[in-house]
């Protein structure tokens, strides 16, 4: 299980009216459920139940976003509509370029994501926990537009990838 280096760039409007970017680095793990490769896109917070819904399945999708899913305690959802892997698969089917799971409340999900799948997704499925998950969710919950870049090697300089 390789380390996933995640850079999160937040777009903030400055008093002068320009957009300023703030970069935060955190680490997670690439799971065996997906590919170990780089991905980048706007962060889209997805509720676990939001991935249950079937009524978007005939849609044309928008691509290139990074789904962030905070998993709940298993007791709160004893009969989930989909497995964690199923949720990752659905997000990718809907156009996600990567999926990041916050597994802090549901550490058993790590094993589910790392069961050697015969048919892993072609996009990265990353999990974060602890301080890194808190950092990520604090940004996601800010109600700001943010972009994530996932890498499988440490970024050399935060500014290198976001030439804003």
């Amino acid at each position: 299980k390789e380390t996933a280096f995640v850079e999160v760039v937040l777009f903030e409007s400055s008093p002068s009216g320009d957009y300023t970017t703030y970069t935060t680095g955190l680490t997670g793990r690439f799971s065996r459920a997906g590919a170990t490769l780089s991905a980048e896109g706007e962060i889209v917070q997805m509720h676990p139940l939001g991935l249950c819904n079937n009524n978007d399945e005939e849609d044309l999708y928008e691509y290139g976003w990074v789904g962030v899913v905070k998993l709940e305690q298993p007791e709160l959802d004893p009969k989930p509509c989909l497995t964690v892997l199923g949720k990752a698969k659905r997000a990718v089917q809907r156009g996600a370029t990567a999926v990041i799971f916050d597994v802090s409340e549901n550490p058993e999900a790590i094993d589910q994501l790392n069961q050697g799948s015969e048919d892993p997704l072609k996009r990265p499925v990353v999990y974060v926990k602890g301080a890194d998950a808190i950092k990520l969710m604090n940004i996601v919950n800010k109600q700001k537009v943010a972009r994530a870049r996932i890498q499988h090697r440490p970024p050399r300089q935060p500014t290198e990838y976001f030439d804003m």
Partner: antibody, heavy 116, light 107 residues
């Protein structure tokens, strides 16, 4: 079937306000980001504003501080509040679904005319 | 703001001809550029996203390429229904910006 229907356009005087709506159906509205794009008839496209599914917003320089994008997920509706309107805001305003870009689904638009 | 320069502003072409439209950006935007088609009286239609990816349902005669800050939309063999206006959009850095458009007409 995905549908986006704009309303609320009309004729207003410079300095006045207007609130546009975009009613969405055929998809889980709360899962998606939404954009407003405007077009002076016969001219080019102008990106106006974006709201993410979690409520974060971005604006074009020309409208920042005057226009406000918002959404009501319970009503499956996107809004654009236009204040301190200027004659150069005259355009057809389209809503479109998408995250960092307006995707394959656009509404037909509602015409805003600012004139004295 | 990132400047997007689209050329040509208008273009005369014959049916079956190969057509190329270019957008140049003022700074690097990776591949964050889309192409849209707009026929008279209609809403724009997404053709290409992330510079090279063909939107589902769009004919394969449309393609996108890029090199550095230069992006091209190519129609390999012009069909009557391709007569329209074409716009590019950079969505790398807000505020997002469209090119001024290219009006494609039949010769």
């Amino acid at each position: 079937e995905v549908q986006l229907v704009e309303s609320g356009g009309g004729l207003v005087q410079p300095g006045e306000s207007l609130k546009l709506s975009c009613s969405a159906s055929g998809f889980t509205f709360s899962n998606y980001g939404m954009h407003w794009i405007r077009q002076v008839p016969g001219k080019g496209l102008d990106w106006v504003a974006y709201i993410s599914n979690s409520g974060g917003s971005l604006y074009a320089d020309a409208v920042k501080g005057r226009f406000t994008i918002s959404r009501d997920n319970a009503k499956n509706t996107l809004y654009l509040e236009l204040n301190s309107l200027k004659s150069e805001d005259t355009a057809i305003y389209h809503c479109a679904r998408g995250y960092s870009y307006p995707g394959p689904y656009w509404g037909q638009g509602t015409l805003v005319t600012v004139s004295s | 703001d990132i400047q997007v320069t689209q050329s040509p502003s208008s273009l005369l072409a014959s049916l079956g001809e190969r057509v190329t439209i270019t957008c140049q950006t003022g700074q690097s935007i990776n591949n964050y550029l889309n192409w849209y088609q707009q026929r008279p009286g209609q809403a724009p239609l997404l053709l290409i996203y992330f510079a090279t990816s063909l939107q589902t349902g769009v004919p394969s005669r449309f393609s996108g390429q890029y090199s550095g800050r230069s992006f091209t939309l190519t129609i390999t063999s012009l069909e009557p229904e391709d007569i329209a206006n074409y716009f590019c959009l950079q969505h790398y850095s807000p505020p997002y910006t469209f090119g001024a458009g290219t009006k494609l007409e039949l010769r």
